[in-house]
C-alpha cells in the first residue's frame, strides 16, 4: 500500500517579507501527478487559494499583486492527485512592513565605539508597540525579535551589546509591531552605521557571533530593557 | 442559476433528532464550501456550522458541538445537518448558505436558501 | 463569547452616503475576521454582499463597498438608493467559527 503522498514545497518570490504594495508571487511545488493546488492561510475560513497546476503540472503560482495586511500570515500549501490530498508543506510566513510609521534607530553613548566597551541600540517608536526588531545587514540570521513582558506597550527597547567586538560593526535597522499580528512590521527605522575601533582581531564578521542571531549555546542573548526575547516570536529572515 | 433548498424540518420533542438536507443546483457544488445559519422568531441570525468544499474541515458553533454534525455529499450536491438532542431554544428557521470557493474569490453567503422551519415542543 | 454589535436602526435619502458600522465585543476588528456583509429583504431573502478579502459578489453595485474604519468593520452605501431599504447583518470570523451582528435596519425615505 502506497504511503502518504510527499509533501510540497512551498516558497515565495522575490521574499517573504514584502512591503506594503509591492507584489509576490508564492508557488507550491508537488509532483507531476497533481492535479490542483491548495494555498491555505493559518486561521482563514475556508481555502484561501486554488489553482490548476502549470504545465508540466509540478507546480502552482499564488499571485498577490499589491501586497496588503489581508495576504501578511502563516501559509501552507497542498496538492491533490488522484489518489488524495498532500501531505501540507512546510510552513510559510509573509510578512508585511509599512504597516505602521518608522521607528527612530540610535546607538548610546554613541554609534563610534571601542572595542570591549558596551553600546546600546534604542529602537523608539512614535506610537507605544509591544514588539521591537532589529535587524543587521548581511548578517546570516538578521533578526533579533524582542517582545515587551506581558504584552505592556512601550515606546521603545533597549538592544545593549557588551562586550562589543569587531563582528558588531556594521549596518542596522529596527522594526516595530503590534502582538495582534507579528506578520505586520512597521517601516524600517533609517540605517544605523556601528562603527568598532581599536580591535586587533579578524574582522571578518562570524555569523554565528552576530548579535542578531537566534541565541545559540556560545551566545549571550540579547535582553533588552524592561523586555525579553520571545522564542515563539524570533523569525529568521534568509 | 444557483438554487439551494432546504427540507426536513418539522416538529419534534425535545431531545430527538431530526436531519436538514439542502439540494444545491446551478453550481459546481464541489468546489464551494457551505454554511448552515438559523434565525430564532423575533431575533437575529446565528450561525451554526461551516464545511470546506470537500469536506476536510468542519466548523461549528460552540452551543451546538457533540450535538450537531454537518456534512456534505458530492455526488448529490446536497448539504447536511444531523441534529440530536434537541433543545426547545433550537426552534428556528434554519437556512443553508454557499461559502466561497477560495478567500481570494468570491464571497462567504452569497446565495441562501429559502429555509425550513424547526419547531422543538412537548 | 465574542459579540458583534451593529447599529439597530439607521435612516437616510435618496442620493447620499450612509456607513453602517460592526463592533466586535473582543477587540479591534482586524483583516482577520474577514468582515462580511449580507443584505436581507422581504421575505427573508438574503445575499451576500462583500466579504471574503473584500471582494464584492457578483451583481452587486459599485456603491456598496466594505472597509475597516478605526476599530470597526464599516459598510459605505455611496448614493443610497431606495431599493437598498433592508436590514444589513455583519458577520466576523474569530479563527473557527463566525459570529453574526444584530443587523442594522436602514430606511431610504
Known amino acids: 500500500q502506497a504511503g502518504p503522498l510527499p509533501k510540497p514545497t512551498l516558497w515565495a518570490e522575490p521574499g517573504s517579507v514584502i512591503s506594503w504594495g509591492n507584489s509576490v508571487t508564492i508557488w507550491c511545488q508537488g509532483t507531476l501527478e497533481a492535479r490542483e493546488y491548495r494555498l491555505d492561510k493559518e486561521e482563514s475560513p475556508a481555502p484561501w487559494d486554488r489553482q490548476n497546476p502549470l504545465e508540466p503540472k509540478n507546480k502552482a503560482r499564488f499571485s498577490i499583486p499589491s501586497m496588503t495586511e489581508d495576504y501578511a500570515g502563516r501559509y501552507r500549501c497542498y496538492y491533490r492527485s488522484p489518489v488524495g490530498w498532500s501531505q501540507p508543506s512546510d510552513p510559510l510566513e509573509l510578512v508585511m512592513t509599512g504597516a505602521y510609521s518608522k521607528p527612530t534607530l540610535s546607538a548610546l553613548p554613541s554609534p563610534l565605539v571601542t572595542s570591549g566597551k558596551s553600546v546600546t541600540l534604542l529602537c523608539q517608536s512614535r506610537s507605544p508597540m509591544d514588539t521591537f526588531l532589529l535587524i543587521k545587514e548581511r548578517a546570516a540570521h538578521p533578526l533579533l525579535h524582542l517582545r515587551s513582558e506581558h504584552g505592556a506597550q512601550q515606546h521603545q527597547a533597549e538592544f545593549p551589546m557588551s562586550p562589543v567586538t569587531s563582528v558588531h560593526g556594521g549596518t542596522y535597522r529596527c522594526f516595530s509591531s503590534h502582538g495582534f499580528s507579528h506578520y505586520l512590521l512597521s517601516h524600517p527605522s533609517d540605517p544605523l552605521e556601528l562603527i568598532v575601533s581599536g580591535s586587533l582581531e579578524d574582522p571578518r564578521p562570524s555569523p554565528t557571533r552576530s548579535v542578531s542571531t537566534a541565541a545559540g549555546p556560545e551566545d549571550q542573548p540579547l535582553m533588552p530593557t524592561g523586555s525579553v526575547p520571545h522564542s515563539g516570536l524570533r523569525r529568521h529572515w534568509e | 442559476q444557483v438554487q439551494l433548498v432546504e427540507s426536513g424540518g418539522g416538529v419534534v420533542q425535545p431531545g430527538r433528532s431530526l436531519r436538514l438536507s439542502c439540494a444545491a443546483s446551478?453550481?459546481?457544488?464541489?468546489?464551494?464550501?457551505m454554511h448552515w445559519v438559523r434565525q430564532a422568531p423575533g431575533k437575529g441570525l446565528e450561525w451554526m456550522a461551516g464545511?470546506?468544499?470537500?469536506?476536510?474541515?468542519?466548523y461549528y458553533i460552540d452551543s451546538v458541538k457533540g450535538r450537531f454534525t454537518i456534512s456534505r455529499d458530492n455526488s448529490k450536491n446536497t448539504l447536511y445537518l444531523q441534529m440530536n438532542n434537541l433543545r426547545a431554544e433550537d426552534t428556528a428557521v434554519y437556512y443553508c448558505a454557499r461559502d466561497v470557493i477560495s478567500m481570494v474569490r468570491g464571497v462567504p453567503f452569497d446565495y441562501w436558501g429559502q429555509g425550513t422551519l424547526v419547531t422543538v415542543s412537548s | 463569547d465574542a459579540v458583534v454589535t451593529q447599529e439597530s436602526a439607521l435612516t437616510t435619502s435618496p442620493g447620499e452616503t450612509v456607513t453602517l458600522t460592526c463592533r466586535s465585543s473582543?477587540?479591534?476588528?482586524?483583516?482577520?475576521?474577514?468582515a462580511n456583509w449580507v443584505q436581507e429583504k422581504p421575505d427573508h431573502l438574503f445575499t451576500g454582499l462583500i466579504g471574503?478579502?473584500?471582494n464584492r459578489a457578483p451583481g452587486v453595485p459599485a456603491r456598496f463597498s466594505g472597509s475597516l474604519i478605526g476599530d470597526k468593520a464599516a459598510l459605505t452605501i455611496t448614493g443610497a438608493q431606495t431599493e437598498d431599504e433592508a436590514i444589513y447583518f455583519c458577520a466576523l470570523w474569530y479563527s473557527n467559527h463566525w459570529v453574526f451582528g444584530g443587523g442594522t435596519k436602514l430606511t431610504v425615505l
Open positions: 473582543t477587540g479591534a476588528v482586524t483583516t482577520s475576521n474577514y
Open positions: 446551478g453550481f459546481t457544488f464541489s468546489n464551494y464550501g
Open positions: 464545511i470546506w468544499f470537500d469536506g476536510t474541515n468542519k
Open positions: 471574503g478579502i473584500n
